[in-house]
């Protein structure tokens, strides 16, 4: 499973697309800034095994994909960029799924600490509630776009785990 190269390449492409999606100046949205508490401390203090890293990355990308697949998201972004970004995420999910199967066998599921999955889910819950509270305003989406870019960059420890041999 040659994930590290493909994943970092797709990750870079997704980040570039996400950067291009920005429509308004972040400076005009300073009043909407919010602390979403990406669980980086939990991730940084942990040496991820490959199967663990794959599961947590999958959850992050799945939640990002779901977030940007909503009707509210379609209204907020330039359609062709949004489609390219979603396609990139979808490809990443496919790569990760193929790796899960290859790493642990078709019938098995990877063992890992479920609290990391929950930490990711709760992080995206905070993002979802923020968007709803702000009624999916352009500034709220801008804040979320910047946050997702940060979270994609944060997950370095997870990416180290991808290079590890279990």
């Amino acid at each position: 499973c040659d994930l590290p190269q493909t994943h970092s390449l797709r990750n870079r492409r997704a980040l570039i697309l996400l950067a291009q999606m920005g429509r308004i100046s972040p400076f005009s949205c300073l009043k909407d800034r919010h602390e979403f508490r990406f669980p980086e401390e939990e991730f940084d203090g942990h040496q991820f095994q490959k199967t663990q890293a794959i599961s947590v990355l999958h959850e992050m990308i799945q939640q990002t994909f779901n977030l940007f697949s909503t009707e509210d998201s379609s209204a907020a972004w330039e359609q062709s960029l949004l489609e390219k970004f979603s396609t990139e995420l979808y490809q990443q999910l496919n790569d990760l799924e193929a790796c899960v199967i290859q790493e642990v066998g078709v019938e098995e599921t990877p063992l890992m600490n479920e609290d990391f999955i929950l930490a990711v889910r709760k992080y995206f819950q905070r993002i979802t509630l923020y968007l709803m509270e702000k009624k999916y305003s352009p500034c709220a989406w801008e804040v979320v776009r910047a946050e997702i870019m940060r979270s994609f960059s944060f997950s370095t420890n997870l990416k180290k785990g991808l290079r590890r041999k279990d």
Partner: antibody
Framework: QVQLVQSGAEVKKPGASVKVSCKAS????????MHWVRQAPGQGLEWMGE????????IYAQKFQGRVTMTRDTSTSTVYMELSSLRSEDTAVYYC????????????WGQGTLVTVSS | EIVLTQSPATLSLSPGERATLSCSAG???????LYWYQQKPGQAPRLLIY???NLASGIPARFSGSGSGTDFTLTISSLEPEDFAVYYC?????????FGQGTKLEIK
């Protein structure tokens, strides 16, 4: 619209296994974790575990670990919950419920499947 | 495991009255992950309130939720005949996810 349709009622003997199915439609099956919750007659709700239909990853409640197996078939958008070594206390209605975030968390439930364990 | 204790177990009220249902957590629950469900006989539970105080789609405004930490409340301002059912609080703040034992709201 989102729909979760479960298999029919089952009667099992103690020690046997039961496999309940939950067929999803109206959304992208692989995008959301599916949960199983049970309810004994006249009792409250009890969370059993969840499965990510995308890659089959499961998380089980400690209480059911070793007795429960959740699987999925992406070709038919169906998840399964198998419970083994059945005892009378497992007599309950078993529900599948779709995960999500915000107002989507457990917003969609199957109609329930009654499993009766009796000798 | 976070134990959720609901009180009272049964609440007998008349239509038009105000209902206050309590949910007490054994340890602190972040309000974002505390939900309320309604269940009628022979039916699956129905989402009422998400993240402590937000009304789910299609739920009438007479329902409201509040609380934080370990104490949460579901209030029905003026009971309608269709509100008589069992109500469950639920947390997904930590594994295993848990439900309260339920409060049965019955007609007096």
């Amino acid at each position: 619209q989102v729909q979760l349709v479960q298999s029919g009622a089952e009667v099992k003997k103690p020690g046997a296994s039961v496999k309940v199915s939950c067929k999803a439609s109206g959304y992208t099956f692989t995008n959301y974790w599916m949960h199983w919750v049970r309810q004994a007659p006249g009792q409250g709700l009890e969370w059993m575990g969840e499965i990510n239909p995308s890659h089959g990853r499961t998380i089980y409640a400690q209480k059911f670990q070793g007795r429960v197996t959740m699987t999925r078939d992406t070709s038919t958008s169906t998840v399964y919950m198998e419970l083994s070594s059945l005892r009378s206390e497992d007599t309950a209605v078993y529900y599948c419920a779709r995960g999500g975030l915000g107002p989507a968390w457990f917003a969609y439930w199957g109609q329930g499947t009654l499993v009766t364990v009796s000798s | 495991e976070i134990v959720l204790t609901q009180s009272p177990a049964t609440l007998s009220l008349s239509p038009g009255e105000r209902a206050t249902l309590s949910c007490s957590a054994g340890s602190s629950v972040d309000s974002s992950y505390l939900y309320w469900y309604q269940q009628k006989p022979g039916q699956a539970p129905r989402l009422l309130i998400y993240s402590t105080s937000n009304l789910a789609s299609g739920i009438p405004a007479r329902f409201s939720g509040s609380g934080s930490g370990t104490d949460f409340t579901l209030t029905i301002s003026s009971l309608e005949p269709e509100d008589f059912a069992v109500y469950y609080c639920h947390q997904w703040s930590s594994y295993p996810f848990t439900f309260g034992q339920g409060t049965k709201l019955e007609i007096k």
